[in-house]
Amino acid sequence: IPTEIPTSALVKETLALLSTHRTLLIANETLRIPVPVHKNHQLCTEEIFQGIGTLESQTVQGGTVERLFKNLSLIKKYIDGQKKKCGEERRRVNQFLDYLQEFLGVMNTEWIIES
Amino acid sequence: IPTEIPTSALVKETLALLSTHRTLLIANETLRIPVPVHKNHQLCTEEIFQGIGTLESQTVQGGTVERLFKNLSLIKKYIDGQKKKCGEERRRVNQFLDYLQEFLGVMNTEWIIES
């Protein structure tokens, strides 16, 4: 990913820029964007970035707001790279079961599961 | 989702069944299944369930191992339902930015980000 700063720092900077430009971004009062109705964010990355695209096309560019959208596009690249790594490597059933157990464990403890 | 027990209980039961049937599941020594190489599990649900499908097709069915795969298929249904809820509801930019900020916040604190 052609980013000079590590992804973790990129995320921090993006959070700051989001705060800074909030007023400018909400200027369009008629715009409606799909928003996930649950907190399992990773399941919704596609929709989140589609929403970002919609927002970008409706926002007057210039100054550090451009930096915000540039950062978001680098974060998207990082996530796309992670998604590619989901199926790149074949391993023993043993390892697959370890991963599945870990996934279900995380689902059990960390997911917000509606009844 | 046509399941009598809540998803959280379903996940717990599935973890137990996975432990019980591990020996049977790893019996195929030459089988290789794609395993994600990072721990951001939610990004990889599609590949995880494809792997489960491969494993099911290679496993002798019968008894509670069938229950395991039935449970996993119900968990998949639940996750597919969650994914549908990612883009079902359009809301104000304000709400979208709240969600985006939350997403980046979670990414900042909870994701395992490689340098």
Epitope: E89, R90, R91, R92, Q95 | T30, L31, R32, V37
Partner: antibody, heavy 118, light 107 residues
Framework: EVQLVESGGGLVQPGGSLRLSCAAS????????MAWVRQAPGKGLEWVSS????????YYGDSVKGRFTISRDNSKNTLYLQMNSLRAEDTAVYYC???????????WGQGTLVTVSS | DIQMTQSPSSVSASVGDRVTITCRAS??????LSWYQQKPGKAPKLLIY???NLEVGVPSRFSGSGSGTDFTLTISSLQPEDFATYYC?????????FGGGTKVEIK
Amino acid sequence: EVQLVESGGGLVQPGGSLRLSCAASGFTFSHYYMAWVRQAPGKGLEWVSSISYEGDITYYGDSVKGRFTISRDNSKNTLYLQMNSLRAEDTAVYYCASQTLRESFDYWGQGTLVTVSS
Amino acid sequence: DIQMTQSPSSVSASVGDRVTITCRASQDIANYLSWYQQKPGKAPKLLIYGTSNLEVGVPSRFSGSGSGTDFTLTISSLQPEDFATYYCLQDKEFPRTFGGGTKVEIK
């Protein structure tokens, strides 16, 4: 039962070429990276080359880079090693091995001897 | 490239002995290490993968441990069929590199 059978070894002059083949059976060939590992007489093991599932990614050891080419035909369950510009130091038993990428060389062939000599 | 240094290069031992072979990587390889056994005129055979996972069919007297740069293969009670040469391999990155080998001989 897993089987890897190498063929194509033999005596060749320095500067000459040889093509090794490895026929695989007993497992899903396309689900494995494949590799060539060699062993010079009385010496240790040396990794030569590896190839990805579909053959789109290849890796080579420094000592063979630019001279050897690894390839595979998944429809024939066969792995190949094209060896050009052979040198005396390439003399070795060449083993074909299936590879689980981050874990090991799982299954090995019996090896085929390549002798480079004038 | 990652260098793998195996020691000792040879060891004389008797049946029933506990034998320990070590392998050191020139840089951190996490747990991406496998061990192989080779008998004269035969192909190598996988014993352990991922540092400590016993390959199917390998007797439980073989065990592996370590992480990062230092790794160990232990044969808890040497059997006549264990006299062979043992190699470690780093599976972390290309080029793959083997240790120089350890020959386990009869005392």
